[in-house]
Amino acid sequence: LIIGFGISGRHSITVTTVASAGNIGEDGILSCTFEPDIKLSDIVIQWLKEGVLGLVHEFKEGKDELSEQDEMFRGRTAVFADQVIVGNASLRLKNVQLTDAGTYKCYIITSKGKGNANLEYKTGAFSMPEVNVDYNASSETLRCEAPRWFPQPTVVWASQVDQGANFSEVSNTSFELNSENVTMKVVSVLYNVTINNTYSCMIENDIAKATGDIKVTESEIKRRSHLQLLNSKAS
């Protein structure tokens, strides 16, 4: 969490941003809040990006003002216009690109003063893994697949019964480049698994960590997966 204050002495307002990550090809949110003003016409929101000449986005007098918007963001940005009045200056970024990564500044002007805060935005690819029993294999084998990751992640297997065990010798992981030549499909196979045990396939890069669990018993198979972004720090 980054909290910024205005630089004009007593005429300052608090602006808060949260570092976040964008998933390439999907829509992302750059989070920013501020002390709300009472009337929409007095609120100006400017989003800027380090190293970019034009504005990322500008909202003033109750509507978008995009005449100074940089070409790389044309048609891809929007604020939540209905939420500006209660202090939400967050920016929606459509079709996130690798090149969108960087330092952004959320700059706010209201009748109470000015304020700004920076936000670190990482971009990459991350997806939920799915773990299945591989019935085609000669021995009891689990197969963990996740369709889109970038940068290349690490994959680690764990088991509830054999806690702390190193499965690197009995697993094999491959990374297959997807058609857009950036993201990769992750496939990891774990051999010699035993029933009545829960196995976890953990995929992690510097942006996200995802886990796929599978519990195999004589009578049923239970699956669960979750994904966590690693860098949600507020400013």
Epitope: P36, I38, L40, S41, G62
Partner: antibody
């Protein structure tokens, strides 16, 4: 659950002053504007002004600048409005209303003020 | 001050009817308009904000539209519980101002 609890009915003499309260619960009191609205019997709604409890910033409708004084005590999550030099024209129901999610989305039940000699 | 004019003080309707209430601003208020419902003896309730966004829990028979100076609030199929006074409000500039209200009553 967001709630705004207003003080009870007031009967006052012309020329007197009254102070009414609005106790907020269920949200961060210091982060949102608290507005005050006047409604005379059978009439429409008039915006008196608003206070931002986080820093006591106030905005007034010029019409009520000399009539109403808005204050807030953050430790008690309570906003106050004092009306001075009362006349019959001040007989009305006064609402406090906050902008927690959006424009005036939570309202108190109203405080009825009757000015009579 | 911006004047919000609701052209009808009263509107007669029947259950199941579609009804539209108009509100005209004396100057451009972009989309910073809200609509409230008030029943006798009750506090007003927010129905629509930012011209067309339905507030949480508001049935989808209530809609809003417009921008600039002309705004419309519509109930697609009036229910008995919708009989009330409806107010428009601008929050583009202070002082925040309301329309005089339109009372929806049964024919």
């Amino acid at each position: 659950e967001v709630q705004l609890q207003q003080s009870g009915t007031v009967l006052a003499r012309p020329g007197a002053s009254v102070k009414m309260s609005c106790k907020a619960s269920g949200y961060t009191f210091t982060s949102y504007w608290m507005h005050w609205i006047k409604q005379r019997p059978g009439q429409g709604l008039e915006w008196i002004g608003a206070i931002y409890p986080g820093n006591s910033d106030t905005k007034y409708n010029q019409k009520f600048k000399d009539k109403a004084k808005l204050t807030a005590v953050t430790s008690a999550s309570t906003a106050y409005m004092e009306l001075s030099s009362l006349t019959n024209e001040d007989s009305a129901v006064y609402y406090c209303t906050s902008t927690v999610r959006n424009v005036m989305d939570y309202w108190g039940q109203g405080t009825s003020v009757t000015v009579s000699s | 001050d911006i004047v919000m004019t609701q052209s009808h003080k009263f509107m007669s309707t029947s259950v199941g009817d579609r009804v539209s209430i108009t509100c005209k601003a004396s100057q451009d208020v972009r989309t910073a308009v809200a609509w409230y419902q008030q029943k006798p003896g009750q506090s007003p309730k927010l129905l629509i904000y930012s011209t067309s966004y339905r507030y949480t829990g508001v049935p989808d028979r209530f809609t809003g539209s417009g921008s600039g100076t002309e705004f419309t609030f519509t109930i697609s199929s009036v229910q008995a519980e919708d009989l009330a006074v409806y107010y428009c409000q601008q929050y583009y500039v202070t002082p925040l101002t309301f329309g005089a209200g339109t009372k929806l009553e049964l024919k």
